[in-house]
C-alpha cells in the first residue's frame, strides 16, 4: 500500500483466483483513543471500533472511503483505491491501446518545435468518475523539471456503438535549449483513477523523435505567363523553432486531382517555393518535415488550383 | 560561445555539401546496423545514449546561433580551447567564435573517426562477418575533416591485444552510430546556419 496523495492510498493486488487478499491497517488521524468507530462510503453501518481498523482488501467491494468517527463527528478519511496486477502485468483497463506506432501505446505525444513544449493525449471509452494526473521529468534517476498542466477532455468521437473520449495535456521542460542534443529521454507518467480503480501509464521519448511541425503557412499560387505551370510559395509555420537557417525544414509539394485514384505528382524541396503543373480541379498541398532529423511530416496545407 | 552573424562571400562555404553527405552516410549506416543487428538492442529506445565527445569538445555551445544566446538554458557551456585555422573559414571577417565552433566539429570528427576505425578492425575479425562499417561513411568523415583543414595532433588508433567481445562491439557500434547521427544533425544545422549568414 502506498500514498497517492493526502488521505488517498493505493493497494496493489495480485488479481488471480486463489490470491490471498492484502491486509491493510487503517489508523484514525486523531489524538483520541476511545469511542472511535469506522464506516465505509455513505453507509452508516459500523465496520469496527478502535483507533485502528484491520481489513482484508481483495475486491473492489473492499475499496472506498473509510471514515473514522467519534460521537457523530468525522475524525479522518482514508480513500483506498485498487491497482490490479494480472499475470505479473499491471492492468490497463482505463485507457485504449492506440496501437500506433506500436502495440501497447496508450499515450501519444507530439511537439511542434524544439522549445521543450509538447502535448500528450490518450483515449478512453469511460465517460464518468474519471480523473487524471500527469507528471513529467527529463530522465528518471536524477530527474530534471518538466511542468505539466491539467489534463482536459479535448475531443469526443463516436466509434461504432461506442463513444470515445480524448484527453490531452500540455507540458513544458523547465529549462530547455532548442539546440541541445538530448541524451536523457523525457518521461511522462499519467495516473488514472476510474471509480476505485487506479492505473498508471508511462511514455518515454526524446523531443527530437516526437517533432511534428505545423503545416506551412501562407500557401499561395502565382500563375506563370503562357504556361500551365504555377509557382507555389509558402512560409515556415509560426510555431517552428528559430532561426530557420539552423532549424531548417524540407517540404513535399503534391498535386492531387479531384479523384483519390488519380496519380499524385510529388516534388521535394528545401526551398519555400516550387514550380508545378496545375491541373484543372486539382489542388496543391504542401507539408513540412525537419530537414535533418526525419521525424513526422506535418499535416498538409492545401489550395485549389483554380 | 555563440556564432555572430557573419557574411561570408556567397558560395564560399564548401563544408555544407560535405556535412549533408555526412548525415546521409551516417543515417544509412545506422539503418543498415538496425536491420543487420535486429536481434541486438540497437534501437533508440534500447540503447544507452553516450556521447564520446562529452567533456572533450563543446560543439553545441560553441556553435550556438546568435539568436539562441539569449536563452540561458543554452549557455551552460564548458570552456575548451581550439586551434583556429581552417579552410571553411572563407571570409576574413569570420570571428574567433566561428573558428572555435568549426574546430570543435573537427575534433568531434577526429574522435569518431578513431573510434570507428578501431571498431571496424574488431568487426573484421568476427567469424560471423555480420556487419562492417560503410567505407563511404569513413570517406565522408575524412572529406569533411579535410574541408575543415585544421592542424591537429593525430590521435593514434587504439589497438587492443585482448580477444574482442563481438556482441559488446556490435552494441557499442549501435551506441556510437546513434550518437554520431545526433552530432551529424547538429553539424548540418550549423553549416546551414553559417551558409545562410
Amino acid at each position: 500500500i502506498w500514498e497517492l496523495k493526502k488521505d488517498v492510498y493505493v493497494v496493489e493486488l495480485d488479481w488471480y483466483p486463489d490470491a490471498p487478499g492484502e491486509m491493510v491497517v487503517l489508523t484514525c488521524d486523531t489524538p483520541e483513543e476511545d469511542g472511535i468507530t469506522w464506516t465505509l462510503d455513505q453507509s452508516s453501518e459500523v465496520l469496527g471500533s478502535g483507533k485502528t481498523l484491520t481489513i482484508q482488501v481483495k475486491e473492489f467491494g473492499d475499496a472506498g472511503q473509510y471514515t473514522c468517527h467519534k460521537g457523530g463527528e468525522v475524525l479522518s478519511h482514508s480513500l483506498l483505491l485498487l491497482h490490479k496486477k494480472e499475470d505479473g502485468i499491471w492492468s490497463t483497463d482505463i485507457l485504449k491501446d492506440q496501437k500506433e506506432p506500436k502495440n501497447k501505446t496508450f499515450l501519444r505525444c507530439e511537439a511542434k518545435n524544439y522549445s521543450g513544449r509538447f502535448t500528450c493525449w490518450w483515449l478512453t471509452t469511460i465517460s464518468t468518475d474519471l480523473t487524471f494526473s500527469v507528471k513529467s521529468s527529463r530522465g528518471s534517476s536524477d530527474p530534471q523539471g518538466v511542468t505539466c498542466g491539467a489534463a482536459t477532455l479535448s475531443a469526443e468521437r463516436v466509434r461504432g456503438d461506442n463513444k470515445e473520449y480524448e484527453y490531452s495535456v500540455e507540458c513544458q521542460e523547465d529549462s530547455a535549449c532548442p539546440a541541445a542534443e538530448e541524451s536523457l529521454p523525457i518521461e511522462v507518467m499519467v495516473d488514472a483513477v476510474h471509480k476505485l480503480k487506479y492505473e498508471n501509464y508511462t511514455s518515454s521519448f526524446f523531443i527530437r523523435d516526437i517533432i511534428k511541425p505545423d503545416p506551412p503557412k501562407n500557401l499561395q499560387l502565382k500563375p506563370l505567363k503562357n504556361s500551365r505551370q504555377v509557382e507555389v510559395s509558402w512560409e515556415y509555420p509560426d510555431t517552428w523553432s528559430t532561426p530557420h537557417s539552423y532549424f531548417s525544414l524540407t517540404f513535399c509539394v503534391q498535386v492531387q486531382g479531384k479523384s483519390k485514384r488519380e496519380k499524385k505528382d510529388r516534388v521535394f524541396t528545401d526551398k519555400t517555393s516550387a514550380t508545378v503543373i496545375c491541373r484543372k480541379n486539382a489542388s496543391i498541398s504542401v507539408r513540412a518535415q525537419d530537414r535533418y532529423y526525419s521525424s513526422s511530416w506535418s499535416e498538409w496545407a492545401s489550395v485549389p488550383c483554380s | 560561445r555563440n556564432l555572430p552573424v557573419a557574411t561570408p562571400d556567397p558560395g564560399m562555404f564548401p563544408c555544407l555539401h560535405h556535412s549533408q553527405n555526412l548525415l546521409r552516410a551516417v543515417s544509412n549506416m545506422l539503418q543498415k546496423a538496425r536491420q543487420t543487428l535486429e536481434f541486438y538492442p540497437c534501437t533508440s529506445e534500447e540503447i544507452d545514449h553516450e556521447d564520446i565527445t562529452k567533456d572533450k569538445t563543446s560543439t553545441v555551445e560553441a556553435c550556438l546561433p546568435l539568436e539562441l544566446t539569449k536563452n540561458e538554458s543554452c549557455l551552460n557551456s564548458r570552456e575548451t580551447s581550439f586551434i583556429t585555422n581552417g579552410s571553411c573559414l572563407a571570409s576574413r571577417k569570420t570571428s574567433f567564435m566561428m573558428a572555435l565552433c568549426l574546430s570543435s566539429i573537427y575534433e568531434d570528427l577526429k574522435m569518431y573517426q578513431v573510434e570507428f576505425k578501431t571498431m571496424n578492425a574488431k568487426l573484421l575479425m568476427d567469424p560471423k562477418r555480420q556487419i562492417f562499417l560503410d567505407q563511404n561513411m569513413l570517406a565522408v568523415i575524412d572529406e569533411l575533416m579535410q574541408a575543415l583543414n585544421f592542424n591537429s595532433e593525430t590521435v593514434p588508433q587504439k589497438s587492443s591485444l585482448e580477444e574482442p567481445d563481438f556482441y559488446k562491439t556490435k552494441i557499442k557500434l549501435c551506441i556510437l552510430l546513434h550518437a554520431f547521427r545526433i552530432r551529424a544533425v547538429t553539424i548540418d544545422r550549423v553549416m546551414s546556419y553559417l551558409n545562410a549568414s
Epitope: P20, G21, D41, L47, Q56, K58, E59, G61, D62 | -
Partner: antibody, heavy 119, light 107 residues
C-alpha cells in the same frame, strides 16, 4: 434494519429451469457484495460464490461454475441464482448472504430457499 | 482449495460449562476466519470475524482466537440457547470454504 428476504420453496423436475431471488433492504445495496451458500439435506455449508451489485463482477467456486448463474438487478436491490437444467443433486437449501466489506465473511443471511428436484 | 477440519464433530456439554471448538486449515489463512452458529430450520448467524472479533449484537461469552492454521471458538459459560451447529469459514483464498460443522448438544 438489514434484511435479506428470499423467494419461497420450489419443487421442480429434472431438466427444468429455475431462478430464485433474494431482495435486500435496510442498507445501500450497491455497497455490499452478495453471496450464495448451498446446504444439502443433513450436510454442511458450501460457498457457491459472490457477486458485485455495482458491475456484476463474479467470483464462482470452481465446483459450481457452469452449474449455476448469479445475477443482480440494482433497480430492485435483488440478487438471483438460476439453473438452466436442474438435476436431482441440486436438491438443497440455498442461502443468500451479504459480504462484509474489508473482510469477506457473510454478516447477514437470508432465511433460505428450499429447492427440491424430483421426478 | 483450503480444507477446514473441525473437531470434535460432536461436543456434549451442560449449561454453565465452557465449550471449545477447534478448526484447522490445510494451509495458512492468516486471521481471516469467521465462525457461524446454525440452529435447526434457521439460517446461519455470524458470531466471530477476523478470528477474534465479535460480531455486533453477539453476547460476550463467545470468543475466538488463533492465526495461521489453528483456530478456536470458545463459549465461556453455555446458555440453553447456545446448543446448535457451529461452522468455521476461511475467507483468505477463493473458493472460500467452511468446516464440516460441530454439533454442540446438551449432555
Amino acid at each position: 434494519e438489514v434484511q435479506l428476504v428470499q423467494s419461497g420453496a420450489e419443487v421442480k423436475k429434472p431438466g427444468e429451469s429455475l431462478k430464485i431471488s433474494c431482495q435486500s433492504s435496510g442498507y445501500t445495496f450497491t455497497s455490499y457484495w452478495i453471496g450464495w451458500v448451498r446446504q444439502m439435506p443433513g450436510q454442511g455449508l458450501e460457498w457457491i460464490g459472490i457477486m458485485s451489485p455495482v458491475d456484476s463482477d463474479i467470483r464462482y467456486n470452481p465446483m459450481f461454475r457452469g452449474q449455476v448463474t448469479m445475477s443482480v438487478d440494482k433497480s430492485s436491490s435483488t440478487a438471483y441464482l438460476q439453473w438452466s437444467s436442474l438435476k436431482a443433486s441440486d436438491t438443497a437449501m440455498y442461502y443468500c448472504a451479504r459480504r462484509r466489506p474489508g473482510q469477506g465473511y457473510f454478516d447477514f443471511w437470508g432465511q433460505g430457499t428450499m429447492v427440491t428436484v424430483s421426478s | 482449495e483450503i480444507v477446514l477440519t473441525q473437531s470434535p464433530a460432536t461436543l456434549s456439554a451442560s449449561p454453565g460449562e465452557r465449550a471449545t471448538i477447534s478448526c484447522r486449515a490445510s494451509q495458512s489463512v492468516g486471521t481471516w476466519v469467521a465462525w457461524y452458529q446454525q440452529k435447526p430450520g434457521q439460517a446461519p448467524r455470524s458470531l466471530i470475524y477476523a478470528a477474534s472479533n465479535l460480531q455486533s449484537g453477539i453476547p460476550a461469552r463467545f470468543s475466538g482466537s488463533g492465526s495461521g492454521t489453528d483456530f478456536t471458538l470458545t463459549i465461556s459459560s453455555l446458555e440453553p440457547e447456545d446448543f446448535a451447529v457451529y461452522y468455521c469459514q476461511q475467507y483468505n483464498i477463493y473458493p472460500y470454504t467452511f468446516g464440516q460443522g460441530t454439533r454442540l448438544e446438551i449432555k
